[in-house]
């Protein structure tokens, strides 16, 4: 035999102060004939929340038209929620009776509790830059949420990370909670354009997690590689020497040329280019005068990158006899 069921699908409903709460209740039968009322609590002390037929309930509206005789939706909305509204709400079916209606069946109840959304996660990286292959730590913090249950995930370029530790405070009962998580990330040489994301999921966010991001460009230093080469062709009595500084980050770089140990002050031509991975290349050209008395010239290209210790590359200039002859011929 079929019998009326009262369906209250949500066991727990988390609401925010000031917002409107929707309490769902549907029935599976129009029989027995009689009204559906809403109560908070159970037993003789229960509080009437809504009665369609009598009473004044200014904050309560029905979702459906209860005057429609074939209505099976008795859900209600309660506006301007305050902390005083917390409790368990029951929709209750009454059977039409004389002289008064008789309670027939109650729904299982929906507990209304106050929830608070977590703040936007803030991600902080290391204070100093680190080179690839090393591990750096990122912290993520979010505050002010309730209830305590919360999920935090870390991602690097969309890939979930597993090396992290998370704490939610306080451990006991509280009006609001905070979460702090520290993730350890191994830097790759191509991480200039990488991002770490901290994702926080909470019941109050209704499946739309909050995210905080940090760019690994703030945490990484990619040291340059140096190469000094002599151009095979000379221009008049000058030889062109190139210093190529490759794949470095950040851009901060000082380059100086030395000739036989003496720093050269004169202008040199140079170009800066950006690679697809976000690192930079710097090319500097140095023109050396060739003369009879300059048998052995040692050129040094020295680079100081991002305040680190200088690195240098030397080149002993090769001046052929033919080049010397040409140079002396050309000099009056």
């Amino acid at each position: 035999e079929e019998e009326l069921q009262m369906i209250q699908p949500e066991k727990l409903l988390l609401v925010t102060v000031g917002k409107t709460a929707t309490l769902h209740c549907t029935v599976t039968s129009l029989l027995p004939v009689g009204p559906v009322l809403w109560f908070r609590g159970v037993g003789p002390g229960r509080e009437l929340i809504y009665n369609q037929k009598e009473g004044h309930f200014p904050r309560v509206t029905t979702v459906s038209d209860l005057t429609k005789r074939n209505n099976m939706d008795f859900s209600i909305r309660i506006s301007s929620i305050t902390p005083a509204d917390v409790g368990t709400y029951y929709c209750v079916k009454f059977r039409k009776g004389s002289p008064e209606n008789v309670e027939f069946k109650s729904g299982p109840g929906t507990e209304m509790a106050l929830g608070a959304k977590p703040s936007a996660p803030v991600v902080l990286g290391p204070a100093a830059r680190t080179t690839p292959e090393h591990t750096v730590s990122f912290t993520c913090e979010s505050h002010g949420f309730s209830p305590r249950d919360i999920t935090l995930k870390w991602f690097k370029n969309g890939n979930e990370l597993s090396d992290f530790q998370t704490n939610v405070d306080p451990t006991g009962q509280s009006v609001a909670y905070s979460i702090r998580s520290t993730a350890r990330v191994v830097l790759d040489p191509w991480d200039v354009r990488s991002q770490v994301i901290c994702e926080v999921a909470h019941v109050t966010l209704q499946g739309d997690p909050l995210r905080g991001t940090a760019n690994l460009s703030e945490a990484i230093r990619v040291p340059p590689t140096l190469e000094v080469t002599q151009q095979p062709m000379r221009v008049g009595n000058q030889v062109n020497v190139t210093c190529q500084v490759r794949k470095f980050y950040p851009q901060s770089l000082q380059l100086t040329w030395s000739e036989n140990g003496n720093v050269c002050q004169r202008e040199t031509a140079s170009t800066l280019t950006e690679n697809k991975d976000g690192t930079y290349n710097w090319t500097s050209w140095f023109l050396v005068n060739i003369s009879d008395q300059r048998d052995d010239v040692v050129l040094t290209c020295q680079v100081k990158h991002d305040g680190q210790l200088a690195v240098s590359k030397r080149l002993a200039l090769e001046v052929t006899v033919h080049q010397k002859d040409q140079s002396s011929d050309a000099t009056p």
Epitope: E2, L4, T28, L31, S64, R69, N70, M72, D73
Partner: antibody, heavy 119, light 107 residues
């Protein structure tokens, strides 16, 4: 005068999802009081109620299909839709959308659309 | 589910005859019952709602009665355009269920 028109593919492969849309013209789908229905009729057989969606958004489904059925409303397009997943040949039928009036009966129907489930 | 048993499953009558169809519910459904007419290749049409109320625009030769478990649908004077299949439908309990239908033909 309110009119209903079903639309969707006439042929669906087994295990796929059947998707039908019912467009309401001559009235607003979101105006209070109306309930929107899907009913089907197997070839040469009787009528089977699939489910209902209220203007409030509440849904009621036939338990025999509940695990496979979703009914939704798009008020901006004045449409409501039926999705039936994991279809088999047994889902071959004429599918009707209908409006349940203020009193109770389904007073406005679409003309019906035939859906065949076959590979 | 509530079972709706309709009888007869088919009948043949002459124009002008009084035609009666019955519908029995497997349990008490009060007066939560509708009657529909379906012509071949067409969608059903609501004739009677709440067991005995005539739907808008429906000729008065159609009527319905009953409450609880036993319901009757009557065509007082059969017309040629009444050739169709007639269905009862209960909406007291979910899922809503239809009777198996009664096919009405002209002799």
């Amino acid at each position: 005068q309110v009119q209903l028109q079903e639309s969707g593919p006439g042929l669906v492969k087994p295990s796929q999802t059947l998707s039908l849309t019912c467009t309401v013209s001559g009235g607003s789908i979101s105006s209070g009081g109306w309930y929107w229905q899907w009913i089907r009729q197997h070839p040469g057989k009787g009528l089977e109620w699939i489910g209902t969606i209220y203007y409030s958004g509440s849904t009621f489904y036939n338990p025999s299909l509940k695990s496979r059925v979703t009914i939704s409303v798009d008020t901006s397009k004045n449409q409501f839709s039926l999705k039936l997943s994991s279809v088999t040949a047994a889902d071959t039928a004429v599918y009707y959308c209908a409006r349940e009036g203020y009193h109770s009966g389904m007073d406005v129907w679409g003309q019906g659309t035939t859906v065949t489930v076959s590979s | 589910d509530i079972q709706m048993t309709q009888s007869p499953s088919s009948l043949s009558a002459s124009v002008g005859d009084r035609v009666t169809i019955t519908c029995q519910a497997s349990q008490d459904i009060s007066n939560y019952l509708n009657w529909y007419q379906q012509k071949p290749g067409k969608a059903p049409k609501l004739l009677i709602y709440d067991a005995s109320n005539l739907a808008t625009g429906v000729p008065s030769r159609f009527s319905g009665s009953g409450s609880g478990t036993d319901f009757t649908f009557t065509i007082s004077s059969l017309q040629p355009e009444d050739i169709a299949t007639y269905y009862c439908q209960q909406f007291a309990y979910l899922p809503w269920t239809f009777g198996g239908g009664t096919k009405v033909e002209i002799k």
